[in-house]
Amino acid sequence: EEELQIIQPDKSVSVAAGESAILHCTITSLFPVGPIQWFRGAGPARVLIYNQRQGPFPRVTTVSETTKRENMDFSISISNITPADAGTYYCIKFRKGSPDTEFKSGAGTELSVRAKPS
């Protein structure tokens, strides 16, 4: 069984306020089964940005078609970026259970927000 890896290729992404940010995440295996979630920040204060299991998340769309049964691309686009969105974003695989438990995390992508061009 191939060990699941979570690849967040971009260490950092810089976006102008008002634009959309694309945060890339791919996984290398579908197993163990369970949802992908995105968080801003780490630890108990982290903020849920996207959960494959539930929605909607009005400002967040998936870049690829996650309803494909073999999909391994969980990149997201966050629209209308503001300075409050700055931070490090983690793509995390959960293993199914009651409740689902965190299985593996990507290394994180730091989002910085530039001032809107005048």
């Epitope: 089964v33 949802p35 299991r53």
Partner: antibody
Framework: DLQLVESGGGVVRPGESLRLSCAAS????????MSWVRQAPGKGLEWLAG????????YYIDSVKGRFTISRDNSKNSLYLQMNSLTAEDTAVYYC???????????WGLGTLVTVSS | ALTQPASVSANPGETVKIICSGG??????YGWYQQKSPGSAPVTVI????KRPSDIPSRFSGSASGSAATLTITGVRVEDEAVYFC???????????FGAGTTLTVL
């Protein structure tokens, strides 16, 4: 109110074709994968085919591969099943079902009866 | 293939458990589907192993462990008489399968 309404069933002769339709309402059809499931008289449920939300990816059980084609028209909120070279073994009630994020089913149509008889 | 008992019976108010075996916990999610009469529309009572749709009474619950899933009806009622099909999605094959169904009789 979420609704799935199948149509297109009827009586056909062996070797003939039939196209089933499923009209969806009450949810954002283009965001969900969909499937067709059938139930032969006195038998259990049998999954036949699934299609991703955008329609680019399709999946079939081996016994209908090459004879049945699942498709969708998101602009019409409609799901289809084209059935060719029908045999008596295809006699069943055919249901369309909405898929959950992990390809189980949360809502079902009322079904449409297909009878293949000479 | 998914295996489940052909029939179970219970008195009103009792707890019923229906076990479905044959999947791989590592790659499989389970669901449970209620059909009150042959050819009528199935109703999803559990999906994703243990998730109950909002319109399903709380007496229905689901769990999964190892190679089996369990549907539990706590305080069964006469109106719960039906055939219950377990279903599974296997992420290895991209295929959905169903058990043969369990007829629940409430005495």
């Amino acid at each position: 109110d979420l609704q799935l309404v199948e149509s297109g069933g009827g009586v056909v002769r062996p070797g003939e074709s039939l196209r089933l339709s499923c009209a969806a309402s009450g949810f954002t059809f283009s965001s969900y994968a969909m499937s067709w499931v059938r139930q032969a008289p006195g038998k259990g449920l049998e999954w036949l085919a699934g299609i991703s939300a955008g329609g680019s990816d399709t999946y079939y059980i081996d016994s209908v591969k090459g004879r049945f084609t699942i498709s969708r028209d998101n602009s019409k909120n409609s799901l289809y099943l084209q059935m060719n070279s029908l045999t008596a073994e295809d006699t069943a009630v055919y249901y369309c079902a909405r898929e959950t994020w992990n390809h189980l089913f949360d809502y079902w149509g009322l079904g449409t009866l297909v009878t293949v008889s000479s | 293939a998914l295996t489940q008992p052909a029939s179970v019976s219970a008195n009103p108010g009792e707890t019923v458990k229906i076990i479905c075996s044959g999947g791989d916990y590592y790659s499989t999610y389970y669901g449970w589907y209620q059909q009150k009469s042959p050819g009528s529309a199935p109703v999803t009572v559990i999906h994703s192993d243990d998730k109950r749709p909002s319109d399903i009474p709380s007496r229905f619950s689901g769990s999964a462990s190892g190679s089996a899933a369990t549907l539990t009806i706590t305080g069964v009622r006469v109106e719960d008489e039906a055939v219950y099909f377990c279903g599974a999605y296997d992420g290895r094959t991209y295929i959905n399968t169903f058990g043969a169904g369990t007829t629940l009789t409430v005495l």
